[in-house]
């Protein structure tokens, strides 16, 4: 679940298993020049930066709950 | 590599408190964590909470609460718990479990500390 | 709170043969489970998490299945060291649950 920071990919492999109770926040990446695939990065808890599957359901589910609570609040 | 080293066994008296301590080594404490799990003698796990190190945050199984209670200190990466009013109920073997930061199973446990209420 | 019921509660099978055990919860905990093993004087040792994901270090012997409320682990080929109790854990919602545990024994 390393994450680069070149501009490039940031993401060379996801994690599984992701659990949002230590997610602090989520960062979508769209496709751009710098990566042709959707990125999504999660700042846990402790300060740590992870790699998502974007085509996960629960990875899915994770980013819709974060965006509704930016939302409401 | 990661290591939980739990205190050693305690033999206390109805009514009265113990404290157990979980020394962590090998990751950075703050940054994750810490579960407590009670099993009873012949019994099976149960959850009764967890600290945070890196803010003190707390989640209690409502079970526990006010039985319970748990600090950590980061000078010393050793977390505790208090347990009060004790009670034979409360004889049991308590173990410390390390949370993983991304995914929560609990990846790490201590050996365990028995605690026997007797008079 | 999630109730996890856990069945068997013991169940005695052959070296070399296979084992299944189920937990049922009481609502859809989105594949947020895990096994352990425990034995006797030890820490209990995380064996499968996420329903599925094999822990480092863990025998591909063991396996897990399932979805919604329910939810399977297995071990074929079995070994002299795989007597042990075996707990699941929901982690879906606090407060965490286990099932009650299988007590795992040989023939």
């Known amino acids: 679940a390393s994450v680069a920071t070149e501009l490039r990919c940031q993401c060379l492999q996801t994690l599984q298993g992701i659990h949002p109770k230590n997610i602090q926040s989520v960062n979508v990446k769209s496709p751009g020049p710098h990566c042709a695939q959707t990125e999504v990065i999660a700042t846990l808890k402790n300060g740590r930066k992870a790699c998502l599957n974007p085509a996960s359901p629960i990875v899915k589910k994770i980013i819709e709950k974060m965006l509704n609570s930016d939302k409401s609040n | 590599q990661v290591q939980l080293q739990q205190s050693g066994a305690e033999l206390v008296r109805p009514g009265s408190s113990v404290k157990i301590s979980c020394k962590a080594s090998g990751y950075a404490f703050s940054d994750y964590w810490m579960n407590w799990v009670k099993q009873r003698p012949g019994q099976g796990l149960e959850w009764i909470g967890q600290?945070?190190?890196?803010?003190?945050?707390?989640n209690y199984n409502g079970k526990f609460k006010g039985k319970g209670t748990l600090t950590a200190d980061k000078s010393s990466s050793t977390a505790y718990m208090q347990l009060n009013s004790l009670t034979s109920e409360d004889s049991a073997v308590y173990f410390c479990?390390?949370?993983?930061?991304?995914?929560?199973?609990?990846?790490?446990w201590g050996q365990g500390t028995s605690v026997t209420v007797s008079s | 709170d999630i109730q996890m019921t856990q069945s068997p509660s013991s169940l005695s099978a052959s070296l070399g043969g296979k084992v299944t055990i189920t937990c049922k919860a009481s609502q859809d905990i989105n594949k947020y489970i895990a096994w352990f093993q425990h034995k006797p004087g030890k820490g209990p040792r995380l064996v499968i998490h996420?329903?599925?994901i094999l822990q480092p270090g863990i025998p591909s012997r063991f396996s897990g299945v399932g979805s919604g409320r329910d939810y399977s682990f297995s071990i074929r080929n079995l070994e002299p060291e795989d007597i042990a109790t075996y707990y699941c854990l929901q982690y879906d919602n606090l407060p965490w649950t286990f099932g009650g545990g299988t007590k795992l024994e040989i023939k």
């Open positions: 479990a390390r949370e993983r930061d991304y995914d929560v199973a609990m990846d790490y």
């Open positions: 600290i945070y190190p890196g803010d003190a945050d707390t």
């Open positions: 996420y329903t599925s």
